[in-house]
Interface confidence: medium
Amino acid sequence: QAGPLPKPTVWAEPGSVISWGSPVTIWCQGTLDAQEYHLDKEGSPAPWDTQNPLEPRNKAKFSIPSMTQHYAGRYRCYYHSHPDWSEDSDPLDLVMTGAYSKPILSVLPSPLVTSGESVTLLCQSQSPMDTFLLFKEGAAHPLPRLRSQHGAQLHWAEFPMGPVTSVHGGTYRCISSRSFSHYLLSRPSDPVELTVLGSLESPSPSPTRSISAAAGPEDQSLMPTGSDPQSGLRRHWE
């Protein structure tokens, strides 16, 4: 009796955070003796889709021509190799942006402040939301996520930054969502530049790297984008 079939790997291209209407491909990679690949979507009858492997038979392609709410969710794949099947892959969370209109992000008291001043970022949504995410371009450390108490629907969230220094300078965006469907996000707000002036310094430089966030009910953090094909907004829901 042979050993267990290796667990396949699943990923999405161009990434796991897709704007409404854009195409996305889910790939499942197993072994060369795979005969069929199956993709399961959480909450849907299994298998959600089945594909024959592409040569050299170690992976399969699941195409979504146009991203909609229907496709947002958590996916796992596995493969069949006669007569058995593999363990499920780790989950892939496919998130759709553009489910709601973009919020407006503003800086209080002003986007141009002096080091030591207290600053608050205000994210305002056009329709009531209960979760607001804040991103900073190039940030490698967590930024806060605000969820309203008891799921109350709000039109805004305040992100108090306290007394700022030059490290707080940079480009920020926010996104809003509703907790009952974490896979659906608003369009990102237009960027807002926070410039922090020191007593003897010029305005702080603005990072140019793109953003990527890990977003989950308990874990909301920002990470720099790398070359990982799944870079983008990731959800860690263990």
Partner: nanobody, 121 residues
């Protein structure tokens, strides 16, 4: 020659438990995924659970958290432990064997005769 033989069905009250057994010939058991289907009167046959050669399991959504499947390689047998039974679990339960892809296609290669499970007060 009967190659899959089920046992353990019967009448049970709602909330009760039953354990179904299926004995298979060694040649079938050692080289196939084993599983259970059920068919209620007037309804389509549905996959309840399957267990692979390596012991991986798939459990149908309607019974998740209540039913478990296991296989005993020494006895060439597969078992379906059914807990928290409901009236809607009433059906004829069939043991089946085949490649997993055939289970997904609702057409395993081997079938038992079936055993009746009735959940009623």
């Amino acid at each position: 020659e009967v190659q899959l033989v089920e046992s353990g069905g019967g009448l049970v009250q709602p909330g009760g438990s039953l354990r179904l057994s299926c004995a298979a010939s060694e040649s079938i058991f050692s080289s196939n995924v084993m599983g259970w289907y059920r068919q209620a009167p007037g309804k389509q046959r549905e996959l309840v659970a399957a267990v692979g050669i390596q012991g991986l399991t798939k459990i149908g959504d309607s019974v998740k958290g209540r039913f478990t499947i296991s296989r005993d390689n020494a006895k060439n047998s597969v078992y379906l432990q059914m807990n928290s039974l409901r009236a809607e679990d009433t059906a004829v339960y069939y043991c089946a064997a085949g490649a997993y892809v055939r289970f997904l296609q609702q057409s395993p290669d081997y079938w038992g005769q079936g055993t009746q499970v009735t959940v009623s007060s």
